[in-house]
Interface confidence: low
């Protein structure tokens, strides 16, 4: 049950059997506590006072590694190591594609300890932003035959786990590509910044009028973009160009981390876009090309002096990383 969180973990890819059952779990915000010390985790579970209570936390000793902390019938807190690798999560040799799936599996399908399942999620005292995000301050071209990924200045990444020596396994939000990047070329993104920043279709800094102008000038028929709603902070608007006009659709986040549009629920705005690429958004029209963020919108100022960083890592040109 109890694990040592101090082990060094690393590795690019796993071939374990994946658990692929439709599993339901409570929303992330009811059980995910972010980076949390083991002692405090035990305190929170004991305060909850019910056997079968659980939470998931990021190990404070090993960033990128997670721990499932569980209060057993014996009133003992057990800590189970969860290894996050390349977007998958491993516990006891089983692979899950999300922490929610893992929770669902040990809530409904299998026992965590003999005769004991996950019963009661323990919510954090305050909301947690669970995924670290970074932004490229310089462009980079991958070294051939490695797990690295190429990227552009301004690309945003979700950090899945931090590997040894300053490398990170990430997803590029613009391209959805997963791979290795090195920390020298990225900067932290503030928690207050919109989580969709970096998606090719997201325009966080433009007005409603600029959205219309972009669709009419840069865009074509069936082009689209998403921007934050003016009327309701926290909501989004999907702007879509038809032959006649620009149509606007409201997207509302829900308390359990889903998004609602047109009475239907989706796991992400990306899923909404994928849906309406295949299904008509208005009669005779499908979403086609997003209008990408324009140069003048770049939130990064272009005065970042990359010379020192590139010298440090021996970058000769933008397109050939190593000598």
């Amino acid at each position: 049950g109890t694990v040592d969180e101090g082990d060094s973990l690393d590795g690019p890819e796993y071939e374990e059997e994946e658990v692929a059952i439709p599993l339901t779990a409570p929303p992330t915000n009811q059980w995910y506590h972010g980076k949390l010390d083991r002692t405090i985790a035990e305190e929170r579970l004991r305060q909850a006072g019910k056997s079968g209570s659980y939470l998931i936390r990021e190990s404070d000793r090993r960033p990128g590694s997670f721990v499932l902390s569980f209060l057993s019938q014996m009133n003992v807190v057990n800590h189970f190591r969860i290894i996050a690798m390349c977007g998958d999560y491993y516990i006891g040799g089983r692979r899950f594609s999300s922490l929610s799936d893992l929770i669902g599996y040990y809530s409904h399908v299998s026992c965590l300890l003999k005769g004991e399942k996950l019963l009661y999620p323990v919510a954090p005292p305050e909301p947690v932003e669970d995924r670290r995000r970074v932004r490229a301050i310089l462009p980079y071209t991958k070294v051939p035959d490695t797990d690295e990924i190429s990227f552009l200045k301004g690309d945003m990444f979700i950090v899945h786990n931090e590997l040894e020596d300053g490398w990170m396994w990430v997803t590029n939000l613009r391209t959805d590509e997963q791979g290795l990047i090195v920390e020298d070329l990225v900067e932290e993104v503030g928690r207050e910044e919109d989580p969709h920043e970096g998606k090719i279709w997201f325009h966080g800094k433009i007005s409603k009028q600029e959205a219309y102008n972009l669709l009419m000038t840069v865009g074509q028929v069936c082009s689209f973009l998403v921007r934050p709603s003016d009327n309701t902070p926290g909501d989004y608007s999907l702007y879509f160009r038809t032959n006649e006009n620009i149509q606007r659709f409201k997207i509302c986040p829900t308390p359990n981390n889903q998004f609602m549009m047109g009475g239907r629920y989706y796991n992400s705005i990306g899923d909404i876009i994928d849906h309406y690429r295949k299904e008509q958004i208005v009669e005779g029209y499908y979403l086609k090309e997003p209008v990408p963020m324009q140069d003048q919108e770049q939130v990064l100022n272009d005065t970042v002096d990359g010379k020192e960083i590139y010298n440090t890592i021996r970058r000769k040109t933008k397109d050939a990383f190593y000598k």
């Epitope: 082990d7 060094s8 973990l9 690393d10 590795g11 690019p12 890819e13 796993y14 071939e15 374990e16 290894i83 690798m85 491993y90 040799g93 490695t146 797990d147 690295e148 590997l163 040894e164 020596d165 300053g166 490398w167 396994w169 290795l180 090195v182 440090t312 890592i313 021996r314 190593y322 000598k323």
Partner: antibody, heavy 117, light 107 residues
């Protein structure tokens, strides 16, 4: 093209120390870590330690008290020093570049160290 | 510390045969395993990393499989130049450790 080249005195005295330099080209020491591995005559491979790209080190516990690995990024050199030599330290010593997460993708050609009085 | 056990310690095969060698880890190392070939008097060369991924320029007759604690390296259609020693390496956190090796000879 990535290359690593070890150079050292070849001969060491018992109880003395030996220093080996690994000179690298084709990549930067501030981007990739360098590991050290040795192979005693007729034996297998033994991992000794690593200097990570940020300058931190990890050593095989068996060598912790007498091994030191340092580097000079600007000269593209890694320095390996093993103290309190014993005859069973006689081996071929290799430096190797860290590939992706973990494994070594390119090795030096090795340098022979013989410990003898 | 994690131990790696390779078997067999030596094997003899004819040109054109398929040979398989195994590496067992003392605990779950997921796919954090690499295979190396070492010819007499030469440095080791990377064959496979992450248990199944071929190294750069490695002939397609070499393939790795397995995860967790059991791993295999298979050589299809053995060539004369394949003789030498083969080592597995775990990189599931330091200290890294090599297996004892498999000596491959041709009949």
């Amino acid at each position: 093209q990535v290359q690593l080249q070890e150079s050292g005195p070849g001969l060491g005295q018992p109880a003395q120390s030996i220093s080996i330099t690994c000179t690298v080209s084709g990549f930067s020491l501030s981007s990739y870590g360098v590991h050290w591995v040795r192979q005693s005559p007729g034996k297998g491979l033994e991992w000794l330690g690593v200097i990570w790209r940020g300058g931190g080190t990890d050593y095989n516990a068996a060598f912790m008290s007498r091994l030191s690995i340092t580097k000079d990024n600007s000269k593209s050199q890694v320095f390996f020093k093993l103290n309190s030599l014993q005859p069973d330290d006689t081996a071929m010593y290799y430096c190797a570049k860290r590939g992706g997460p973990g494994y070594f993708d390119v090795w030096g050609q090795g340098t022979t160290v013989t410990v003898s009085s | 510390d994690i131990e790696l056990t390779q078997s067999p310690a030596s094997l003899s095969a004819s040109v054109g045969e398929t040979v398989t060698m195994t590496c067992r880890a003392s605990e779950n190392i997921y796919s954090n395993l690499a295979w190396y070939q070492q010819k007499q008097g030469k440095s080791p060369q990377l064959l496979v990393y992450a248990a199944t991924k071929p190294g750069n320029g490695v002939p397609s007759r070499f393939s790795g499989s397995g995860s967790g604690t059991q791993f295999s390296l298979k050589i299809n259609s053995l060539q004369p130049e394949d003789l030498g020693n083969y080592y597995c390496l775990h990189f599931y956190g330091t200290p890294y450790r090599f297996g004892g090796g498999t000596k491959l000879e041709t009949k």
